[in-house]
Interface confidence: medium
C-alpha cells in the first residue's frame, strides 16, 4: 500500500465519538463487466461537440485523479468539419462521490465528499430569446 | 440515528484484521462551489443525440438511486428533425464510487463499489470499416 | 406511490417533549431522506432537520440543535421527530416530508420534498 | 444561511389571468429552487423543482424560470382551485430555507 506521513492530530479509529463514522473496506469490487470494454475512447475526438479532457489532481482525495471534460468549442461540428455557432456544444455534468483525506494526510481517516463533474459534451439546440 | 435490523455478522469495526478498512465521516462535503453551480439542464431533450433517463435503485448502495441514460436513437437528429444514420448517437460512461453495505443490513459497514454509468449521449461520426 | 402517514395531534404542556413519527410506504425506504418541517399558525414553513436514512445521519437547523432528535427505524419504515422544553412557541402543524436524495445528474432533481405527511397539530398550553 | 424574499406576499387575481410570484435568493443557489402550494387545511405539495422542471400531474399552466438569485413562478391562466399560498425552497445549502410565502386569491 501507500505510505503517507501520519498528521499527529489523525483521530483515532476506535475513538466512539469520531463523528458519524463507519468502516469502509477499500477492497474495490469493480461491478463493471467486459460487455462493453471500449466505452467512450475516442469519443471526444469523433463527437460533433468534441472535447478536451483535464487531468483533475488531489492526492487527499480518492480518487486522486479525475478527468473533466472542457467543451472545444462554443458550436457544433457540422458535415462539412467546419463550427457551426447556431448550435451549442455543452458539458454534461454528473455529481459524483469521492472520499478526502480528513484531517489531511491521515492514511486511514476520510470523509464522504460530493463533486460536480464534467464528463462530456453534447450538442445541443440554442435556445433563443426573443426581444418583444 | 437509524435502527437497523442488524446481521449477526457483522463486522467488528475494531477488528485490526478487518481487511484495507478506513474510517469515513459521513457527513457529506457539498464541493459544488458557488462558481460551479448545479443549473437544471434540460439538454436530454434538446441534444442532438437526445437520450432517456432510467431510475436504477438498490436500497444497499449509497446514492440508492443513479439516473442511467440510454439513447433514444441509433442515429443523430439533424436540422430538420430527422434521424441522420449517417451520424452515432453513443452513451458517454463515467466510472463512478458508491458505497454498498457489506455484509449486508449492517448499519456501519461499508465496501467501496466501482460501477460503470452513462450519463448522456453525444453525437459522433461513425468509424466505417473498408472492407477490400 | 409514496405515502407518508404522521402519528395523531397533541396537547402537550410548556416543558414537556413530543415524539411524532412518520410511517413510509412504498418506495424503498433507505433510498430516500426524511425532512421535518413545522407550521406555525398563520406562518410560513420552517424546516426543523432531515436524516439520510441510508446512514442514519442526520443535519438539524441551528434554531432546534439540542432540542431536536431525528431518528429512523428501517424494520417498520418510521422516522420520528423528538422535540424537548417545549413552549407555547412550539404550537404548529409538524410535517414530515420525503427528500429524494438524488445525486444530481444535470436533471432530476436531488433534495425537494416531493411528498408530504398529512400533518400532526401540535398544541403546547398550560 | 440563505434567506429567500418572495414577493408579493399577497395578489388577488381574476380567473384567467397570468400570475407572477417571484423568489429572491441572498446569496448564488444555481437551480436548486423547488416550488410549493399549499391550500388552506392541506400539506404542501410540490409544484416545480429545480427551478424549471414541472412535475407528474401538476397542470401545464404552472411552470417555473431562474437560475443564480432570482426565480419567478408562472400560472398561466389561473383557475379557482389555484386559491392557496406559494412557497420557494432553496436546497443548495443547509439549513434548508423557505420563502415567506405568497398568498393568492380569487376575486
Known amino acids: 500500500g501507500i505510505t503517507i506521513p501520519r498528521n499527529p492530530g489523525c483521530p483515532n479509529s476506535e475513538d466512539k465519538n469520531f463523528p458519524r463514522t463507519v468502516m469502509v473496506n477499500l477492497n474495490i469490487h469493480n461491478r463493471n463487466t467486459n460487455t462493453n470494454p471500449k466505452r467512450s475512447s475516442d469519443y471526444y475526438n469523433r463527437s460533433t461537440s468534441p472535447w478536451n479532457l483535464h487531468r483533475n489532481e488531489d492526492p487527499e482525495r480518492y480518487p486522486s485523479v479525475i478527468w473533466e471534460a472542457k467543451c472545444r468549442h462554443l458550436g457544433c461540428i457540422n458535415a462539412d468539419g467546419n463550427v457551426d455557432y447556431h448550435m451549442n456544444s455543452v458539458p454534461i455534468q454528473q455529481e459524483i462521490l469521492v472520499l478526502r483525506r480528513e484531517p489531511p494526510h491521515c492514511p486511514n481517516s476520510f470523509r464522504l465528499e460530493k463533486i460536480l463533474v464534467s464528463v462530456g459534451c453534447t450538442c445541443v439546440t440554442p435556445i433563443v430569446h426573443h426581444v418583444a | 440515528g437509524i435502527t437497523i435490523p442488524r446481521n449477526p455478522g457483522c463486522p467488528n469495526s475494531e477488528d485490526k484484521n478487518f481487511p484495507r478498512t478506513v474510517m469515513v465521516n459521513l457527513n457529506i462535503h457539498n464541493r459544488n462551489t458557488n462558481t460551479n453551480p448545479k443549473r437544471s439542464s434540460d439538454y436530454y431533450n434538446r441534444s442532438t443525440s437526445p437520450w432517456n433517463l432510467h431510475r436504477n435503485e438498490d436500497p444497499e448502495r449509497y446514492p440508492s438511486v443513479i439516473w442511467e441514460a440510454k439513447c433514444r436513437h441509433l442515429g443523430c437528429i439533424n436540422a430538420d428533425g430527422n434521424v441522420d444514420y449517417h451520424m452515432n448517437s453513443v452513451p458517454i460512461q463515467q466510472e463512478i464510487l458508491v458505497l454498498r453495505r457489506e455484509p449486508p443490513h449492517c448499519p456501519n459497514s461499508f465496501r467501496l463499489e466501482k460501477i460503470l454509468v452513462s450519463v448522456g449521449c453525444t453525437c459522433v461520426t461513425p468509424i466505417v470499416h473498408h472492407v477490400a | 406511490e409514496v405515502q407518508l402517514v404522521q402519528s395523531g395531534a397533541e396537547v402537550k404542556k410548556p416543558g414537556e417533549s413530543l415524539k411524532i413519527s412518520c410511517k413510509a410506504s412504498?418506495?424503498?425506504?433507505?433510498?430516500?431522506?426524511i425532512s421535518w418541517v413545522r407550521q406555525a399558525p398563520g406562518q410560513g414553513l420552517e424546516w426543523m432537520g432531515g436524516i439520510t436514512t441510508f446512514f442514519g445521519i442526520t443535519d438539524y437547523a441551528q434554531k432546534f440543535q439540542g432540542r431536536v432528535t431525528i431518528t429512523a427505524d428501517e424494520s417498520t419504515t418510521t422516522a420520528y421527530m423528538e422535540l424537548s422544553g417545549l413552549t407555547s412557541d412550539d404550537t404548529a402543524v409538524y410535517y414530515c416530508?420525503?427528500?429524494?436524495?438524488?445525486?444530481?445528474?444535470?436533471?432530476?432533481?436531488?433534495?425537494?420534498?416531493?411528498?408530504w405527511g398529512q400533518g400532526t397539530t401540535v398544541t403546547v398550553s398550560s | 444561511e440563505i434567506v429567500l424574499t418572495q414577493s408579493p406576499d399577497f395578489q388577488s387575481v381574476t380567473p384567467k389571468e397570468k400570475v407572477t410570484i417571484t423568489c429572491r435568493a441572498s446569496?448564488?443557489?444555481?437551480?436548486?429552487l423547488h416550488w410549493y402550494q399549499q391550500k388552506p387545511d392541506q400539506s404542501p405539495k410540490l409544484l416545480i423543482k429545480?427551478?424549471?422542471h414541472s412535475i407528474s400531474g401538476v397542470p401545464s399552466r404552472f411552470s417555473g424560470s431562474g437560475s443564480g438569485t432570482d426565480f419567478t413562478l408562472t400560472i398561466n391562466g389561473l383557475e379557482a382551485e389555484d386559491a392557496g399560498t406559494y412557497y420557494c425552497h432553496q436546497s443548495y445549502d443547509l439549513p434548508h430555507t423557505f420563502g415567506q410565502g405568497t398568498k393568492v386569491d380569487i376575486k
Open positions: 416530508a420525503r427528500d429524494p436524495n438524488e445525486f444530481w445528474n444535470g436533471y432530476y432533481a436531488t433534495h425537494d420534498f416531493d411528498y
Open positions: 412504498g418506495g424503498s425506504f433507505r433510498s430516500y431522506g
Open positions: 446569496q448564488i443557489i444555481g437551480s436548486e
Open positions: 429545480y427551478a424549471s
